[in-house]
Interface confidence: medium
C-alpha cells in the first residue's frame, strides 16, 4: 500500500500555485530534483529536513523542490499564482476528519468531546505524562492538538486542561460520515480518497499502478482532483483506481445525503412525451423497445441479471419497466423480456427537437439556424423584416439578411448571451430564446479574461455634477423597499434604470416595491430634503443564470447633489488584480442596535484562479463572475446588501464592476466574495437601456 513511490497520493495538489512566506522566521528547504514524486517521498519521510514537512512546491521550470514546515492555512503565509509551480499539501494537515482510528490525524482541533480545552503535549501541567513530542517523532504532538499517537480505539484524544479530567477523546468525525453524495454521486466533488476496504486511491493524473483513460485534462468537468473518489461513468456510486497493483478499482464508502434530491441545476430537462438530447431526462411511460418487445422491470433480475436497479440508480426514475437512460447511453433503453435479447433502444420515442430544429447553439449562437420562434417568457417572435429599423438602431453594421428569415430566433448583433428575437409586445421589445449552449461547447464568449486588454474605464475624465465630483458621494446607491421595508441594494445606472439582483423580488406584484434614492439612513431619517421615492414599473430579467435584474423606475430620477448615476464598465474588460474596490449596503443585519447608516467595506480585486484557491477549490469561477477579497483578514467582503454594487475606480472614474448576489460565500473570514461580473453583461445592459421605452420626465 505505501511503497516509496506512492507517497504523492497523500498530498492535495493545487496547480499553478506557490506559497510565499510573509513571516521571515519561517524556514524552507530547496533542492534540485526531477519529479514531484521525489519531493513527496522526502516530505513524507522528513529525510534530511530540519523541520516537519507539511507541504512542498514543485518548480517545473527549474526542476526544483521547495519543502515547507507550513501549508496554505498557516499564518504568515500567502498563496500566489505562478505558471511553473504546483503546490502539494499533506492531506493529514488539512483534513478535518479522521480515517479509521485517526492515527494519521494532524488537524488543529484542540477541544475534547465534552468541550474541555486540551493541555499542550510539551506541558506537564496539570497532568504529568510520557507523551513527549521528542518520544513520538512523526506523530506531530504539536501545541495542544488532539492526536492518536498509538492508534488507540477511541480515536484522537488529549490530556485536558481540567485537573479533574486526565484525558478525553476529541469529537472528530469519521471522513466517511462527513462525506455524502446525492443520487449515484455523479456530481460528488468531496475529498474521500480511499476505498470501502481502506485502500488508498491512485491519483487520476497518474498511470501507475493502473493505466486508465480518465485523464483530468481530457475530462475537465469530471472533478478529477488528486486521488479523490469520483463517478465519471454512471456507476452506482463513486469509485477510484487503487494503489494495490492487484485491485484495479473499488467503490468508495460515501453515504447518501439526508436529502437525496438533486439540485435543480443538476437535473436534466425532464420530458414525458419526447426525448431531449440523449433522453437522460425522459420520464415517460413507453415500455417497449423499438420493435415492440416489452421491457423487463428494472427491479427484476429475470430474464436478465443486471445492476441497473432502482436502489443503485436512485435519481434515474427506474420505475416499472419504462424506457430510461440511467447510464448516459445514446438514448433511452431497457432490458427486454425476451431471454435472447438482453437490451434494446426505445428509438420509437420521438425527439423533442423535431419541431424546433436545432436545440442548442455554439459560441454565442451567431450561426444558430434553428427554427425556434418563441422567447423564454413564451412570447411569439415577430418577423425580422418588421424590425429592421430597430435593429439598425443598435448595431453599426449591415446584418446578414439571409439568416434573418421568418421570425426565428437569431443573433444578428453578436449578443454574448445567445439567440433572441423581437416580440410584438411594446413592453418587452425583445427577449432571449430558451435555447442552451450545446453540451461540451467551451467556446469563450469573451476572450483573454486574465489579460487586461480592455480597460474598464471609458477614456473620459471624471464627470462633475453641479460642481460636486461624483466620486465623493454615493448618490447612485438605491434602497429597494418591499412593503415599506428595505430588502436590497441597487445601483442607479441611468435616470430610469436600477441594476440589482434577481433574488430581491419575491413577489410578482410591482406595487409592492419602491426605490428610495438620495438617502444615507435606511429609514430615511434626516434625509427628507434629499430623498426621492420612486415606484417600479418593470423588471427586466438578465440573461439565463446571470442573477441580474434591471429595474425600470416609473419616472426618471432627478439627478442632483444627492442622486447621481454610476458608470458601467466597458464590455468584457478586465480590472487589474489588487485594484482597490468597495461594497456598499445598509447591511440586512437584523441587529437590534443597528444604526441604519450606509456601510462600506473595502476590498481588492483577486484573479479568478486565486479566488478559487481561497475557496479551497470548492467553487470554480467563470467569465461571468468577479472576485474581491477583504483587505483586513477576517473582514467579510459582503457586508452590503444583495443587489448592491462592487464599485471600483480606474483612471479616476468610478464604475459598478460587480453585483452582490446570494449564495456566493460572502462574509466568511479569509474567503473572498464572488460577485456577478457586470462587464460580462454590459452589452446586455446597454441594449436594454437603448431598446426599452422609458417614461419622459
Amino acid at each position: 500500500q505505501r511503497k516509496r513511490r506512492n507517497t504523492i497520493h497523500e498530498f492535495k495538489k493545487s496547480a499553478k500555485t506557490t506559497l510565499i512566506k510573509i513571516d521571515p522566521a519561517l524556514k524552507i528547504k530547496t533542492k534540485k530534483v526531477n519529479t514531484a514524486d521525489q519531493c513527496a517521498n522526502r516530505c513524507t519521510r522528513n529525510k534530511g529536513l530540519p523541520f516537519t514537512c507539511k507541504a512542498f512546491v514543485f518548480d517545473k521550470a527549474r526542476k526544483q523542490c521547495l519543502w515547507f514546515p507550513f501549508n496554505s492555512m498557516s499564518s504568515g503565509v500567502k498563496k500566489e499564482f505562478g505558471h511553473e509551480f504546483d503546490l502539494y499539501e499533506n492531506k493529514d494537515y488539512i483534513r478535518n476528519c479522521i480515517i479509521g482510528k485517526g492515527r494519521s490525524y494532524k488537524g488543529t482541533v484542540s477541544i475534547t468531546k465534552s468541550g474541555i480545552k486540551c493541555q499542550p503535549w510539551s506541558s506537564m501541567i496539570p497532568h504529568e505524562h510520557s507523551f513527549l513530542p521528542s518520544s513520538y517523532r512523526g506523530k506531530d504532538l504539536q501545541e495542544n492538538y488532539c492526536r492518536n499517537p498509538r492508534g488507540e480505539e477511541g480515536g484522537p484524544w488529549c490530556f485536558t486542561s481540567n485537573p479533574e479530567v486526565r484525558y478525553e477523546v476529541c469529537d472528530i468525525p469519521q471522513c466517511s460520515e462527513v462525506e455524502c453524495m446525492t443520487c449515484n454521486g455523479e456530481s460528488y466533488r468531496g475529498l474521500m480518497d480511499h476505498t470501502e476496504s481502506g485502500k488508498i486511491c491512485q491519483r487520476w493524473d497518474h498511470q501507475t499502478p493502473h493505466r486508465h483513460k480518465f485523464l483530468p485534462e481530457r475530462y475537465p468537468d469530471k472533478g478529477f482532483d488528486d486521488n479523490y473518489c469520483r463517478n465519471p461513468d454512471g456507476q452506482p456510486r463513486p469509485w477510484c483506481y487503487t494503489l494495490d497493483p492487484h485491485t484495479r478499482w473499488e467503490y468508495c464508502a460515501i453515504k447518501t445525503c439526508a436529502d437525496n434530491t438533486m439540485n435543480d441545476t443538476d437535473v436534466p430537462l425532464e420530458t414525458t412525451e419526447c426525448i431531449q438530447g440523449q433522453g437522460e431526462g425522459y420520464r415517460g411511460t413507453v415500455n417497449t423497445i423499438w420493435n415492440g418487445i416489452p421491457c423487463q422491470r428494472w427491479d427484476s433480475q429475470y430474464p436478465h441479471e443486471h445492476d441497473m436497479t432502482p436502489e443503485n440508480f436512485k435519481c434515474k426514475d427506474l420505475r416499472e419497466n419504462y424506457c430510461r437512460n440511467p447510464d448516459g447511453s445514446e438514448s433511452p433503453w431497457c432490458f427486454t423480456t425476451d431471454p435472447n435479447i438482453r437490451v434494446g433502444y426505445c428509438s420509437q420515442i420521438p425527439n423533442c427537437d423535431m419541431s424546433h430544429g436545432q436545440d442548442c447553439y455554439r459560441g454565442n449562437g451567431k450561426n444558430y439556424m434553428g427554427n425556434l420562434s418563441q422567447t423564454r417568457s413564451g412570447l411569439t417572435c415577430s418577423m425580422w423584416d418588421k424590425n429592421m429599423e430597430d435593429l439598425h438602431r443598435h448595431i453599426f453594421w449591415e446584418p446578414d439578411a439571409s439568416k434573418l428569415n421568418e421570425n426565428y430566433c437569431r443573433n444578428p448583433d453578436d449578443d454574448a448571451h445567445g439567440p433572441w428575437c423581437y416580440t410584438g409586445n411594446p413592453l418587452i421589445p425583445w427577449d432571449y430564446c430558451p435555447i442552451s449552449r450545446c453540451e461540451g461547447d467551451t467556446t469563450p464568449t469573451i476572450v483573454n479574461l486574465d489579460h487586461p486588454v480592455i480597460s474598464c474605464a471609458k477614456t473620459k475624465q471624471l464627470r462633475v455634477v453641479n460642481g460636486i465630483p461624483t466620486r465623493t458621494n454615493i448618490g447612485w446607491m438605491v434602497s429597494l423597499r418591499y412593503r415599506n421595508k428595505h430588502i436590497c441594494g441597487g445601483s442607479l445606472i441611468k435616470e430610469s434604470w436600477v441594476l440589482t439582483a434577481r433574488q430581491c423580488f419575491p413577489s410578482r406584484d410591482l406595487k409592492d416595491y419602491e426605490a428610495w434614492l438620495g438617502i444615507h439612513d435606511v429609514h430615511g431619517r434626516g434625509d427628507e430634503k434629499c430623498k426621492q421615492v420612486l415606484n417600479v414599473s418593470q423588471l427586466v430579467y438578465g440573461p439565463e443564470g446571470s442573477d441580474l435584474v434591471l429595474m425600470k423606475l416609473a419616472r426618471p430620477a432627478v439627478l442632483d447633489d444627492f442622486v447621481s448615476t454610476i458608470d458601467l464598465p466597458n464590455y468584457g474588460c478586465t480590472i487589474p488584480e489588487k485594484t482597490s474596490c468597495s461594497v456598499y449596503g445598509w447591511g440586512y443585519t437584523g441587529l437590534i442596535n443597528y444604526d441604519g447608516l450606509l456601510r462600506v467595506a473595502h476590498l481588492y480585486i483577486m484573479g479568478n484562479e486565486k479566488c478559487s484557491q481561497h475557496h479551497r477549490g470548492k467553487v470554480t469561477l467563470n467569465e461571468s463572475e468577479i472576485c474581491a477579497g477583504a483587505e483586513k483578514i477576517g473582514s467579510g467582503p459582503c457586508e452590503g446588501d444583495y443587489g448592491g454594487p462592487l464599485v471600483c475606480e480606474q483612471h479616476k472614474m468610478r464604475m459598478v464592476l460587480g453585483v452582490i448576489v446570494p449564495g456566493r460565500g460572502c462574509a466568511i473570514p479569509n474567503r473572498p466574495g464572488i460577485f456577478v461580473r457586470v462587464a460580462y453583461y454590459a452589452k446586455w445592459i446597454h441594449k436594454i437601456i437603448l431598446t426599452y421605452k422609458v417614461p419622459q420626465s
Epitope: T182, C257, A258, D259, N260, T261, M262, N263, D264, R483, I487, C488, R502, Q503, C504, F505, P506, S507, R508, D509, K511, D512, Y588, G590, Y642, P662, G663, R664
Partner: antibody, heavy 114, light 114 residues
Framework: VEESGGRLVMPGTPLTLTCTVS????????ISWVRQAPEKGLEWIGV?????VTDYASWAQGRFTISKTSTTVDLKIPSPTTEDTATYFC?????????????WGPGTLVTVSS | DIVMTQTPSSVEAAVGGTVTIKCQAS??????LAWYQQKPGQRPKLLIY???TLASGVPSRFKGSGSGTQFTLTISDLECADAATYYC????????????????FGGGTEVVVK
C-alpha cells in the same frame, strides 16, 4: 428538509420548530411553513426568502416568527394556544419567490394542551 | 381575499375508473396553481405545477388543466395507491387584496378507491 422541535406544551409556553435542510442551499431557495390541524386541511403560515425577508399570512402575523441560519429555518411560536395544535411542515419553495412547494419535510407534531 | 373552492370534498370511484376534482379561484390567478397529493400520516407530495406541468416522477395518469379561475385535476386508470386527499394551491397574489391571498390551499378532496 426535516422538521424538529415538535412536542407537547402548555398554552403560553414559547416553542421553536427547526427545519434543517441539506442537499440544497438556502441562498437559492425560499422556505415556507405550512401546518395541518388533526383531520383538517393544509394552512400556509409564512415564508422566508433567499434574502432573509419574511412574509406571513395575515392570521399568522404577530403569532409566528420565521428566521434562518445557513442551513436551518426556525419557526417561533411565542405564545401557543390550543388552536395551534397541528403537524407543522416546512417546504422548499421552487426558486426564490412565490412558487409551488417541490419538497416537503415529514412534519413535526405540536400539541398544545393544559 | 382570493378564495380557493375545491369540489367535491369527497369522491369514490372504482379501480380503473376516472376521477375529476375541480378548483375554483375567486379571481384570475392565471396558471399559478399547483396540485398536491397527501396520504394519511404522510407529507404532501407535489403532483402538478403551473396548472398542467407534471412534477418529476408523477405518472401521466394525473392530468392538470385550466387557467384563470377554473382548474381541474383528472386521475384516470385509478389505482388503489391513488387513495389520498388532493389539495390545490394558488401561488398568485395581488396586493389589491390583503397579503394572505397567496399560497392559499383549497379545502381538499378525499379520493376513495373501491
Amino acid at each position: 428538509v426535516e422538521e424538529s422541535g415538535g412536542r407537547l406544551v402548555m398554552p403560553g409556553t414559547p416553542l421553536t420548530l427547526t427545519c434543517t435542510v441539506s442537499g440544497f442551499s438556502l441562498s437559492s431557495n425560499a422556505i415556507s411553513w405550512v401546518r395541518q390541524a388533526p383531520e383538517k386541511g393544509l394552512e400556509w403560515i409564512g415564508v422566508i426568502y433567499v434574502i432573509g425577508v419574511t412574509d406571513y399570512a395575515s392570521w399568522a402575523q404577530g403569532r409566528f416568527t420565521i428566521s434562518k441560519t445557513s442551513t436551518t429555518v426556525d419557526l417561533k411560536i411565542p405564545s401557543p394556544t390550543t388552536e395551534d395544535t397541528a403537524t407543522y411542515f416546512c417546504a422548499r419553495v421552487y426558486d426564490s419567490g412565490w412558487n409551488h412547494f417541490n419538497l416537503w419535510g415529514p412534519g413535526t407534531l405540536v400539541t398544545v394542551s393544559s | 381575499d382570493i378564495v380557493m373552492t375545491q369540489t367535491p370534498s369527497s369522491v369514490e370511484a372504482a379501480v380503473g375508473g376516472t376521477v375529476t376534482i375541480k378548483c375554483q379561484a375567486s379571481e384570475n390567478i392565471y396558471r399559478l396553481l399547483a396540485w398536491y397529493q397527501q396520504k394519511p400520516g404522510q407529507r404532501p407530495k407535489l403532483l402538478i405545477y403551473s396548472a398542467s406541468t407534471l412534477a418529476s416522477g408523477v405518472p401521466s395518469r394525473f392530468k392538470g388543466s385550466g387557467s384563470g379561475t377554473q382548474f381541474t385535476l383528472t386521475i384516470s386508470d385509478l389505482e388503489c395507491a391513488d387513495a389520498a386527499t388532493y389539495y390545490c394551491q394558488n401561488y398568485y397574489y395581488s396586493s389589491r387584496s390583503s397579503y394572505d391571498t397567496y399560497n392559499v390551499f383549497g379545502g381538499g378532496t378525499e379520493v376513495v378507491v373501491k
